[in-house]
């Protein structure tokens, strides 16, 4: 048998094959050691037993989407059943004192590798055997402490295939340079040692996407914006774009990455360097907003420029190639791909990436004052608690609730916190009472909000003793 | 000077469906949060829902809540209270009052009984 | 049951001080306003105080309102036969997210 035959169904063409060529990865036209590593269909029997206690489910990730050029990394990761987990020398024990439906079990191991192979290596001091290969025969790696590596991962994507041994989690990174763009499929089988031979305990698999658009989102935060997600932010304060580039392999660490945006209320383009950008709207509506992010990407070379005429000016050395038609496959772009030319074959290409949000601008309270304090006399006995007025101004829209969290001096330990609806007039003034429970000094977050917006003002303030003769002070 | 007057009373059956209407003058509608509440013949006063004068918040008795949706047109100066799945308990004078942290005006109240 | 606590009924005779107990808790009476509210016999109900102690225009002096704790009274001087009425106090509650009555205090004018 063949790796195709064994690891998917999915056929990549001949140009595909010959075009996706993934480095350190072998065609899945070798031969697979079907003695060595038995291949079950889905369905076969001998799944149900080929683990003690229960099924394994292997969990495959990666970071997808990539830039075209950049590093993909898949992890995948082995849940075992109930009361079920790796040592540190590799051996699958039951957790102490977990019960599963076999209750608690008398032997602490599920696997006890170790014991195994110590019992069955009986080979030549080189530590090698037959039957420590990989299902192409390859010897494994004899990396330290490589024998309390029980699992046996076999990646295929792309008509290759990739072996790893590890232990109940692994990771693998692949560069997208010869990828084709769009969307492909990984596949992972997993193997366990059993004995001399091994046998399949999971398969998955995974879609991820390789692409030349650089994959960008933007977080937006404005002050006393109520809900940050729901793309309504206020009238006449900033707001904080921040754009995050999807790059965990830092392919575009050494990019001078250029951001251009439109706010969709005629302000114009705005270029900048900065990955945040403060923007304040001016008018209420919905507006359209858009971002393209550009960064000079390692990429490939275009072919050398023909020898110069000595009729003809020399040409540029920055040639322009027009992209690939979106129908072929094989690294395509939107955009003419910009290539410039640079004496050592290191190339740049010009990657483009894109935003776009609906936003809807609102009336909202934009600033909150407190610009009184009042003790409140109240009629005795009720020696051991003050009441305060606090007048309170605002600007913006009409708030309609108002929260006063009362805390220690440092403003960390909340002690008290009463939310109630407001009526307030067009004037913004009001006046919010609350109970303060003995003298001392306090902390005093008073809150307005409305449907969309939340503002806040912090005072220090200082009770005194129920002595009429001792004022209220603004400790602050 | 400040009316509101309440309509949409009457005669339902358990299980129906009534809608209340709040028409309101001498005030500037659409600055001022809304409120419901109700009294059973011979008792106490029962506070029902209260509106923000955006209608992007709405707070509801726990008697009410998910029957009752209380909501307003701005252009026509009218709070409404949607009553579904009524209950004989449902039985009261439902007045419409303005503002929501003191009821400073009352309408004259609509009744609304809930009988087989 | 009310989650404020007011009693049934209260009586005076014409040009005597009443007051009415108010009793709550600090979700509601004790950090929030209170108002008092009238309702004489088969009419609407009429704010009476706001505030704590609050009077609106066209409720006469004879009126007040005051708040100690987590309670809060009304008193009614010069008592007159008009005077004759329900009387409620309410505030909203911070922990029950609602706003909320006294059972009502049945006054009556001996």
């Known amino acids: 048998k063949r790796f195709h035959d064994v690891l998917g169904n999915e056929r990549p063409s001949a140009y595909m094959r010959e075009h996706n060529q993934l480095n350190g990865w072998s065609s899945d036209e070798n031969d697979w050691n079907e003695k060595l590593y038995p291949v079950w269909k889905r369905g076969d029997m001998r799944w149900k037993n080929s683990w003690k206690g229960g099924r394994v489910q292997a969990v495959l990730t990666s970071d997808s989407p990539a830039l075209v050029g950049s590093n993909i990394t898949f992890a995948v990761n082995l849940i075992f059943p109930r009361c079920q987990k790796e040592d540190a020398n590799g051996n699958i024990v039951y957790e102490k004192n977990c019960r599963n439906e076999a209750g608690l079990s008398a032997d602490p191991y599920v696997y006890n590798w170790t014991a195994w192979s110590e019992d069955s290596d009986g080979e030549n001091g080189t530590g090698q055997s037959h039957h420590n290969v990989f299902p192409d025969g390859k010897p494994f790696p004899h990396h330290p402490g490589w024998r309390r590596w029980n699992f046996i991962y076999v990646f295929h994507t792309l008509g290759q295939y990739f072996q790893k041994l590890g232990r109940c989690s692994v990771r693998v990174s692949v560069n997208t340079a010869n990828v084709t763009l769009g969307p492909q499929l990984m596949e992972v089988t997993v193997y366990r040692r059993h004995g001399r031979a091994y046998v399949p305990i999971a398969q998955v698999k995974d879609v991820y996407v390789v692409t030349d658009q650089i994959p960008v989102f933007v977080t937006m935060f404005q002050k006393n914006d109520r809900n940050s997600s729901d793309e309504t932010f206020l009238k006449d304060l900033p707001i904080m774009f921040d754009v995050l580039i999807h790059d965990p392999s830092h392919f575009l660490n050494y990019s001078t990455i250029n951001y251009k945006w439109s706010f969709g209320d005629n302000t114009g383009l705005f270029v900048s360097t900065n990955h945040t950008v403060n923007h304040t709207y001016v008018l209420n509506g919905t507006f359209s907003l858009n971002l393209t992010v550009k960064a000079a990407a390692p990429g490939p070379c275009p072919p050398p420029p023909p020898p110069p005429r000595p009729s003809k000016p020399t040409p540029s050395l920055a040639t322009t190639l027009k992209s690939y038609d979106s129908n072929t496959p094989g690294p395509a772009g939107d955009n003419p791909l910009e290539l410039s030319r640079i004496p050592d074959e290191n190339c740049q290409i010009n990657r483009y990436g894109h935003f776009q949000a609906t936003i809807t601008i609102v009336e909202g309270i934009l600033e909150v004052n407190i610009i009184q304090m009042t003790d409140v006399l109240m009629p005795v006995p009720w020696p051991e608690s003050s009441l305060i007025d606090f007048v309170v101004t605002c600007q913006g829209s009409i708030p309609t609730e108002v929260c006063t969290i009362i805390s220690d001096p440092t403003c960390e330990i909340t002690q008290n916190t009463v939310c109630s609806p407001v009526d307030v007039d067009e004037m913004c003034l009001l006046t919010v009472r609350r109970t303060f429970n003995g003298s001392g000094t306090y902390c005093v977050n008073l809150t307005l909000g409305d449907d969309t917006s939340l503002a806040l003002t912090s005072t220090l303030i200082s009770v005194p003793d129920r002595d009429p003769a001792s004022p209220l002070r603004m400790a602050n | 000077e400040v009316q509101l007057l309440e309509s949409g009373g009457g005669l339902v059956q358990p299980g129906g469906s009534l809608r209340l209407s709040c028409a309101a003058s001498?005030?500037?509608?659409?600055?001022?949060?809304m409120s419901w509440v109700r009294q059973a013949p011979g008792k106490g006063l029962e506070w029902v829902s209260s509106?923000?004068?955006?209608?992007?918040?709405?707070y509801y008795a726990d008697s009410v809540k998910g029957r009752f949706t209380i909501s307003r047109d701005n252009s026509k100066n009218t709070l409404y209270l949607q009553m579904n799945s009524l209950r004989a308990e449902d039985t009261a004078v439902y007045y419409c009052?303005?503002?929501?942290?003191?009821?400073?005006?009352w309408g004259q109240g609509t009744l609304v009984t809930v009988s087989s | 049951q009310s989650v404020l606590t007011q009693p049934p009924s209260a009586s005076g005779t014409p040009g005597q001080r009443v007051t009415i107990s108010c009793s709550g808790s600090?979700?509601?009476?004790?950090?929030?306003?209170v108002s008092w509210y009238q309702q004489l016999p088969g009419t609407a109900p009429k704010l009476l105080i706001y505030?704590?102690?609050q009077r609106p225009s066209g409720v006469p002096d004879r009126f007040s309102g005051s708040k100690s704790g987590t309670s809060a009274s009304l008193a009614i001087s010069g008592l007159r036969s008009e005077d004759e009425a329900d009387y409620y106090c309410?505030?909203?509650?911070?922990?029950?997210?609602?706003?909320?009555f006294g059972g009502g205090t049945k006054l009556t004018v001996l």
């Open positions: 309410g505030a909203w509650d911070s922990s029950l997210n609602a706003y909320v």
């Open positions: 505030a704590d102690s």
């Open positions: 009052a303005r503002k929501w942290s003191t009821f400073d005006y």
């Open positions: 509106i923000s004068h955006s209608g992007g918040s709405k």
């Open positions: 001498g005030f500037t509608f659409r600055k001022l949060n």
């Open positions: 600090s979700s509601n009476i004790g950090n929030n306003y």
